[in-house]
Amino acid sequence: NKGTDDATADSRKTYTLTDYLKNTYRLKLYSLRWISDHEYLYKQENNILVFNAEYGNSSVFLENSTFDEFGHSINDYSISPDGQFILLEYNYVKQWRHSYTASYDIYDLNKRQLITEERIPNNTQWVTWSPVGHKLAYVWNNDIYVKIEPNLPSYRITWTGKEDIIYNGITDWVYEEEVFSAYSALWWSPNGTFLAYAQFNDTEVPLIEYSFYSDESLQYPKTVRVPYPKAGAVNPTVKFFVVNTDSLSSVTNATSIQITAPASMLIGDHYLCDVTWATQERISLQWLRRIQNYSVMDICDYDESSGRWNCLVARQHIEMSTTGWVGRFRPSEPHFTLDGNSFYKIISNEEGYRHICYFQIDKKDCTFITKGTWEVIGIEALTSDYLYYISNEYKGMPGGRNLYKIQLSDYTKVTCLSCELNPERCQYYSVSFSKEAKYYQLRCSGPGLPLYTLHSSVNDKGLRVLEDNSALDKMLQNVQMPSKKLDFIILNETKFWYQMILPPHFDKSKKYPLLLDVYAGPCSQKADTVFRLNWATYLASTENIIVASFDGRGSGYQGDKIMHAINRRLGTFEVEDQIEAARQFSKMGFVDNKRIAIWGWSYGGYVTSMVLGSGSGVFKCGIAVAPVSRWEYYDSVYTERYMGLPTPEDNLDHYRNSTVMSRAENFKQVEYLLIHGTADDNVHFQQSAQISKALVDVGVDFQAMWYTDEDHGIASSTAHQHIYTHMSHFIKQCFSLP
């Protein structure tokens, strides 16, 4: 930063609320799509360019004028793997977090014309190209269809689809949100011969119902009804099938072969939680018990003589946890070697740190190929010689991310590929590999401005800078920007990390108001090395507020001792640790302990509310947006993972002990702003309605705001601007700022 250390002498503007809301200073991305092992697509001025990775030269793949006469606004595009067709998506209508419906047209790149015959129907729920060639699978009205050629009629694979009841090839609400993080429940085999799919049955799942007010002219509000299993309620059931797309015909129904869950799953409620093709004729399925501390991986082979899939019990791999649940959020996916006879997977080791283990399909035990008091975040690529992974090992910073490669012939030979590239600017990397991992794009997202670079795996040399955000850097030189501090405190001999967004010209001899920005859900991380331009940037830059975040017990990427500390006890240690963090910050000498606030969204709204209702005396005020208030109101998959079942035999007592409502009396000591969208399909408005009722019942004065027809993100342009303006006023009033 230019300017002086003296705030009064710095005439530069600050980063304002308007700058945040209007996105005045935009981070530039470099979003590429690999189409081969040496080429990628990149959109520039609405032209789609194809780049050669080695040399950096480009040519126009598709001119922006190609679809001038199309008559629809194209939301997205997808090129077939053989490069012959482009799928155009329009009429996009959002459903939940990942799901949407849309219309699709297919453009023939050879003939340079739209295919007009046998079109995909409107309101299609999901479409995907086969991994090679140009077959298409799509889901419409909860049934699956396959196109062998874009201009040929579709073959109907399923006939049982029924809205809100039977879902073929797409997820229901809870599987979308909590299991697959996707609407798709279709999995092509590597060469596109087989199509695997899940079928979800929500017949017995209770419905959440809420009003949708819509346009002012609507006399009676619409009622939205969604099958949504709350904790302890009836769950969806799942079946799994594989269909051979080579055998499809219009005159006979497709034969889908079912693969049943292992016997150890069928004894009770269970989930399908991962599907991974190992080879053309081998598939791995992971199943998870409703009590999510026990999972089984099945490895199933196609038997050509019978046309069936066989899953040998001898090849089953059990993963369990004695201290909590399996996986960070679900069991991790396996990464198979080319022959499909072995795989690598991230699992917890004896010390409770998540590392890569090497499995052979016919052996129970695995060999850990990484170890240490740090964690592997993800396996990014696997070649015949190397495995590439992201971890937070470097400098013992859990909030950092770097790319490593490990030699498969000698696990002691590990190289960090990103650590020393730009160590001041770049400490948090993600990666995108080309099809066979010959090249990779590194995406550095902090602590400096984002930097995108291209590299060759042959010698790991940097080929070129793709985007360095130099234009933004130049603009921000003229702004008084906050600084970011990432450090740790030691509590009970354990390191706990925090971050602080510090006002420009921060002076540790002065006293600043502090806002604790909290999430604190299981396996969360709020203290990291990422550069962000957000509400906190405004609060620190313009209002001189320190915005801090703290990763206490329950947080992720630091081992199971920390993460599993809150097992079966949500609303306890993670709440207490936020209070303790604020106390520790108060002792640092630069915090005005009469002006400490807390805010959070979703799980963060729950923790905020539990903190404010704790009677600690540490916080003057706080804001809870879309909070959970009682775990029986939230969905089964997420809640039961950490809390078990709300039954007397299991964990009902703690379900009842961990509500916000039970702390209503203590809200008399704080200023509270409660906010929720009325059309929140995820954390239902019910949750805030019950907080409000409890507060009213004990005579607590508090502030509240609802956002009509907004969901969990409160993300429409007007609502987004309104909520942040409203929260800014509240915080400024709480801190007695002009």
Epitope: E117, L152, S247, S249, T252, T255, G307
Partner: antibody, heavy 116, light 107 residues
Framework: EVQLVQSGGGVKQPGETLRLTCTAS????????VHWVRQAPGKGLEWVGV???????DYDAAFMSRVTISKDTSKSTAYLQMNSLRAEDTAVYYC??????????WGQGTTVTVSS | DIQMTQSPSSLSASLGDRVTITCSAS??????LNWYQQKPDGAVKLLIY???NLHSGVPSRFSGSGSGTDFSLTISNLEPEDIATYYC?????????FGSGTKLEIK
């Protein structure tokens, strides 16, 4: 390489039973259906029936009562059995691989002559 | 059953000629029509599937068109090896039915 090799033709007496064999290579009979058609001398092609990959069968109504199509997947072989042969069953019989809604590979054909 | 009517039943053309064979269905069959070539020795092969799609390995001089009830097969530049009988076949509904065939000869 995909191939269909036919055998079992020849001269038959009226009233006898015919059993034709179609041996497949380069693909699996559990994946692909096998159809049978016939062509009487100097005439066009007439569809007889099909056995699908999953073992289900469909027949032309004209042959339903006296034709059975079967397969032995372990031998990669499909069979056409026709009972109560008559003179008008004299024809070249073809088996074909079903690929979606067309026949992409045909056997070489086998001649059946029904004569007393 | 769906009846398939092919015309002409035979035709004679010179090498290099453009030849068109037509096929009509007794009811609408959308694009579910295939064309086959039967050589004098009896060997049969697929030429065109789903009205207009060229089967792999088939020379590009063969093309198909049509939908609904009326279809055609065109050979744009007749070659000696094209001497054969050509059949259309509907695949929309069982029983599958074929046209009566068009025998193509060289003048």
């Amino acid at each position: 390489e995909v191939q269909l090799v036919q055998s079992g033709g020849g001269v038959k007496q009226p009233g006898e039973t015919l059993r034709l064999t179609c041996t497949a290579s380069g693909f699996s009979l559990t994946t692909y259906g096998v159809h049978w058609v016939r062509q009487a001398p100097g005439k066009g092609l007439e569809w007889v029936g099909v056995i699908w990959g999953d073992g289900r069968t469909d027949y032309d109504a004209a042959f339903m009562s006296r034709v059975t199509i079967s397969k032995d997947t372990s031998k990669s072989t499909a069979y056409l059995q026709m009972n109560s042969l008559r003179a008008e069953d004299t024809a070249v019989y073809y088996c074909m691989r079903n690929r979606h809604d067309w026949f992409d590979y045909w056997g070489q054909g086998t001649t059946v002559t029904v004569s007393s | 059953d769906i009846q398939m009517t092919q015309s002409p039943s035979s035709l004679s053309a010179s090498l290099g000629d453009r030849v068109t064979i037509t096929c009509s269905a007794s009811q609408g069959i959308r694009n579910s029509l295939n064309w086959y070539q039967q050589k004098p020795d009896g060997a049969v092969k697929l030429l065109i599937y789903y009205s207009s799609n060229l089967h792999s390995g088939v020379p590009s001089r063969f093309s198909g068109s049509g939908s609904g009830t009326d279809f055609s097969l065109t050979i744009s530049n007749l070659e000696p090896e094209d001497i054969a009988t050509y059949y259309c076949q509907q695949s929309i509904k069982l029983p599958f039915t074929f046209g009566s065939g068009t025998k193509l000869e060289i003048k």
